[in-house]
């Protein structure tokens, strides 16, 4: 807390410049009016003030704003958007999608942290769901997003956002997140045509059911295995030997090179030893 | 450019247990299972076992069961091989190696991590 | 488990001699599961040939590989300087996946 004092002679600031560095942190406090800071807060990133002197103009804005920043100031944050807490984001009531690139550019190249989290957590709430330019948005800055979201928040994407996942985006998700986005992604790509469908469809299908994976089978997909095994074990299970082949085209002999882990090992185990042989890869049920 | 980094070298006690890292990076990680193999004195190969990042399900030469504990980490890309009650027989160079879903053999190593087991 | 026993275990070649590596397994191998890696000194070991004949990436004409069932063989048409290393055999057509002893080719 920095004691109140009162500004010295000509020392008040009539606007956010950088003449401002040179001023003490009890000046800055003294000297430098909040609603001129709030109303000049693009130019606070052009100058380089110390972190102690963006403490004090962090102590003004919130005295100015207990309650919460409003969204014109929240755009122009910069580096000070570093400063906050998530209790302090909490507060705030971000509806525009180029506040939330402005403030995510700040925290490029670094790993989410909890001031993004929160604000990503805010925004997100504010709109009701997860829109795909939003998806799009946050996707762009960190790959990981969608696989951080809990199975209840992945079931606000609407189908419509599943156009904005890319491959890598699934990376890390688990097979209760797949659990949810699949259904999502068959609706989305409901219309395409057999290839187009399987390859926009292929990082989803780790949700996919029996059933769908049957019918694939039935369209001369090629699935790899790296797609393969991703799949739901319990999905996998009941495939017959005919099945799988098909489903993997002349990528069946793969079986062999993961004979050992889930889910091929234990779709191995439920198989006749003879149906396996026709598959001439020496896989030992 | 595929690129497999494993931690400089390590000089451990007997008795201790030492844990090498293998960062992976210029693929999906998530296509590739990670193997380990062991190289004593320059000589032979001999191949610990592979963990599969999708499931963290691993597979180990029973030579190294209890010895060897493999491991991935899918959010840093990074898998690992933890040994342990480490012996003058532990001290080797340690590479990992990837190998694409589906497919035998190694197509690329990390530059090996030399364990010098003594007190 | 599969031994794999590599022969000779260290030979020498003038430049331009034709070299063959031998790989013996003690029981019988899919040939696709067979594979060969090359390793030169303080360095990891590469990926050489594949599937008992198919070439790797990058590896020259001259090598070439053969075999089935229990025998395996590396070849290299002309030996070259470069070509100096270690190669070694390797299967994963059962547990656990082996590895040769390895060959030691030096250049005379």
């Known amino acids: 807390e920095v004691e109140k004092t009162a500004c010295p002679s000509g020392k008040k600031a009539p606007e956010i410049d950088e003449s401002l560095i040179f001023y003490k942190k009890w000046e800055l406090e003294a000297c430098v009016d909040a609603a001129l800071l709030a109303t000049q807060m693009d130019r606070v990133n052009a100058i380089p003030f110390t972190y102690e002197q963006l403490d004090v103009l962090k102590h003004k804005l919130d005295e100015l704003y207990p309650q919460g920043y409003p969204e014109s100031v929240i755009q122009h944050l910069g580096y000070l958007f570093l400063k906050m807490s998530p209790e302090d984001i909490r507060k705030w009531n971000v509806t525009s999608l180029e506040t939330l690139k402005a403030l995510l550019e700040v925290n490029k190249g670094h790993e989410m942290s909890p001031q993004v989290a929160t604000l990503i957590d805010r925004f997100v709430k504010g709109r009701g769901q997860l829109d795909k330019d939003t998806l799009d948005t946050l996707t762009a800055f960190y790959p990981g997003y969608l696989c951080s979201l809990s199975p209840e928040e992945l079931s606000s994407v609407p189908p419509s956002s599943i156009w904005a996942v890319r491959p890598q985006d699934l990376d890390t998700c688990d097979p209760r997140q797949l659990d949810v986005l699949y259904p999502k992604a068959r609706l989305a790509f409901q219309n395409m045509n057999g290839s187009e469908y399987f390859v926009k469809i292929q990082s989803f299908l780790g949700g996919a059911p029996t059933e769908d994976l049957k019918a694939l089978s039935q369209q001369n997909v090629s699935m790899d295995l790296a797609t393969f095994m991703k799949l739901r074990t319990d999905a996998v299970l009941p495939l017959t030997v005919a099945e799988v082949q098909k489903l993997l085209g002349p990528h069946v002999e793969g079986l062999k090179a993961e004979e050992r882990h889930r889910p091929v090992r234990d779709w191995i185990l439920r198989q006749r030893q003879d149906d396996l042989d026709t598959l001439g890869l020496g896989l030992q049920g | 450019d595929v690129q497999l980094q494993q931690s400089g070298p390590e000089l451990v006690e007997p008795g201790a247990s030492v844990r090498i890292p293998c960062k992976a990076a210029g693929h999906t990680f998530t296509d590739y299972n990670v193997d380990w193999v062991k190289q004593s004195h320059g000589q032979s190969l001999e191949w610990i076992g592979d963990v599969n990042p999708n499931t963290d399900g691993a597979i180990y030469n029973q030579k190294f069961e209890g010895k060897a504990t493999l491991t991935v980490d899918t959010s840093s890309s990074t898998a690992y091989m933890e040994l342990r009650s480490l012996t003058s027989e532990d001290t080797a160079v340690y590479f990992c190696?990837?190998?694409?879903?589906?497919?035998?053999?190694?197509?690329?190593w990390g530059q090996g991590t030399t364990l010098t087991v003594s007190s | 488990q599969v031994v794999l026993t590599q022969s000779p275990a260290i030979m020498s070649a003038s430049p331009g001699e034709k070299v063959t590596l031998t790989c013996g397994a003690s029981s019988s191998l899919i040939s696709k599961y067979l594979y060969w890696y090359q390793q030169k000194p303080g360095s990891s070991p590469k990926l050489w040939i594949y599937s008992t004949s198919n070439l790797a990436s990058g590896v020259p004409a001259r090598f070439s590989g053969s075999g089935s069932g229990t025998s395996y063989s590396l070849t290299i048409s002309s030996m070259e300087a470069e070509d100096a290393a270690s190669y070694f055999c390797h299967q994963w057509s059962s547990y656990p996946y082996t590895f040769g002893g390895g060959t030691k080719v030096e250049i005379k």
């Open positions: 190696a990837r190998r694409r879903l589906g497919q035998g053999g190694f197509d690329s």
